[in-house]
């Protein structure tokens, strides 16, 4: 029944209490005011309302705050946070780390990764800084979430998070995301040297610019061909034969097996034949 019914006389509540459990759904829809709910979220969470009833309350709150919930309400959501979608959260404006931490506690162990990501993203967007508790909460979420943040949000992620990123965590990241994450990784690993540095930075190399790759070639990284193939074509094609030689080190011979495939083929096309000949691998540009 989609027709909006009027609230029966005397049924309009002044407080949130157990009596509301016995209201029919249409009565809740007609009688309960969104601002009443917003002011008494602690009671909404305390009283054992059904999932359906809670859905009606959410609908009422959404109608009261069409531009997104105010932070005063968000802070009080408690377990009601579980009924909020990532799309809802994206409309919020959260500035307090306390608000974030309160909701993170609620979401713990609840399979709410998407909501947590959206919440942290919206906090970052408002200029928030990630404290230890927030970072700890993010630790429990697969790091592919980094690709779900907007590029602007990524800037606010502390470089320390880069230490946790695994080999395939960034597979669905856009080029722009990877570029930002590469810079963060460089900053995170700046005090790491030699082979350990390369092992760490390797995951992020899809975001390395031509200049980054040239700089990397100065550090004896001995890049394997599998990693080389994941580099941006645009970054790769501008590298000289000497730079690629320094980048690959002892793996330079593996170019031969990949010469007909992108990005090796694209790189070969941009080189002078005499320079390729100097490698002694029989590569054709």
């Amino acid at each position: 029944d989609t027709e909006q019914k009027a609230c029966p006389p005397g049924k309009e509540p002044n407080v949130v209490d157990e009596n509301l459990i016995f209201y029919q759904n249409w009565e809740l829809e007609a009688c309960v005011d969104g601002t009443l709910l917003a002011g008494q979220m602690d009671l909404v969470n305390e009283i054992p309302f059904t999932y359906e009833q809670l859905s009606i309350f959410k609908h009422k709150l959404d109608k009261t705050y069409p531009q997104g919930y105010p932070e005063s309400l968000i802070k009080q959501l408690g377990h009601f946070f579980r009924y909020v979608s990532p799309e809802d959260i994206r409309q919020w404006n959260v500035t307090s780390p306390d608000t974030v931490n309160t909701l993170l506690k609620v979401s713990k162990g609840q399979k709410m990764d998407a909501q947590v990501i959206a919440l942290v993203a919206c906090y970052l967007r408002g200029g928030g800084k990630l404290d230890e508790d927030i970072v700890k909460a993010l630790d429990n979420i697969p790091l592919s979430y980094l690709c779900d943040f907007s590029p602007q949000d990524l800037h606010a992620i502390p470089s320390s998070v880069m230490w946790l990123v695994g080999l395939h965590d960034l597979d669905k990241c856009s080029q722009r995301h990877l570029g930002i994450l590469y810079q963060k990784a460089c900053s995170a690993f700046q005090n790491v040297s030699g082979l350990e540095y390369f092992e760490k930075i390797r995951t992020f190399l899809g975001g390395a610019s031509r200049e980054d790759l040239r700089a990397l070639s100065q550090h004896n990284v001995s890049m394997d061909i599998a990693t080389f193939k994941k580099l941006q074509v645009d970054a790769l094609v501008g590298l000289s034969v000497a730079e690629v030689q320094k980048l690959l080190g002892p793996h330079i011979g593996d170019l031969k097996t990949e010469e007909d495939k992108s990005p090796v083929r694209d790189w070969l096309f941009r080189q002078q034949q005499k320079d390729l000949d100097s490698l002694g691998l029989g590569l054709q540009g």
């Epitope: 200049e211 550090h219 000289s240 000497a242 030689q245 080190g249």
Partner: antibody, heavy 117, light 107 residues
Amino acid sequence: EVQLVESGGGLVQPGGSLRLSCAASGFTFSDYFMSWVRQAPGKGLEWVATISNGGTYTYYPDSVKGRFTISRDNSKNTLYLQMNSLRAEDTAVYYCARFDGYYFDYWGQGTLVTVSS
Amino acid sequence: DIQMTQSPSSLSASVGDRVTITCRASQDISNYLNWYQQKPGKAPKLLIYYTSRLHSGVPSRFSGSGSGTDFTLTISSLQPEDFATYYCQQGNTLPYTFGQGTKVEIK
């Protein structure tokens, strides 16, 4: 034809500063790492600084770190070396060189810097 | 830092002679060894890179060999224009370092 022309050398007192310039032509300047290499009178060659093609990365040996700053202006095809807190042992001919991966493939004619009171 | 040691420091030879200059690195530099030629009052010029590859325009009488720590520059038949000082340089590891030079003089 690749051409590198250094300028800005001269006599400077110990503790003083000097800025060298290197005008590049005959190649796409913004595509290459660039370096400064020096040679004290009657002595061998010493690498002084390298800068990445976009200017993001810079490299120095310990002997000049913190005193010398390499920079570049790709819109002017020019490389710079700002030298501060100069010492007598910095007296040398300073060469600007194009760097490719692991070697210096083209060099300028050099500019003499003399540090003396 | 990697130390580069050239020998001899100087040598006297005649036109047509075969000349060999050696360069030793204090640690393994793979094949990232380059040779430069410098004439008095002039800038150095790249002769050979990656141990044995001739830079463009360099005559074939120049050749290089070696690997790891020991390297050689050979001039098969010395010409009048080859009298100069020769420097080796390692490009394997920062900081890049040069040998002290070998002066090739006319006997």
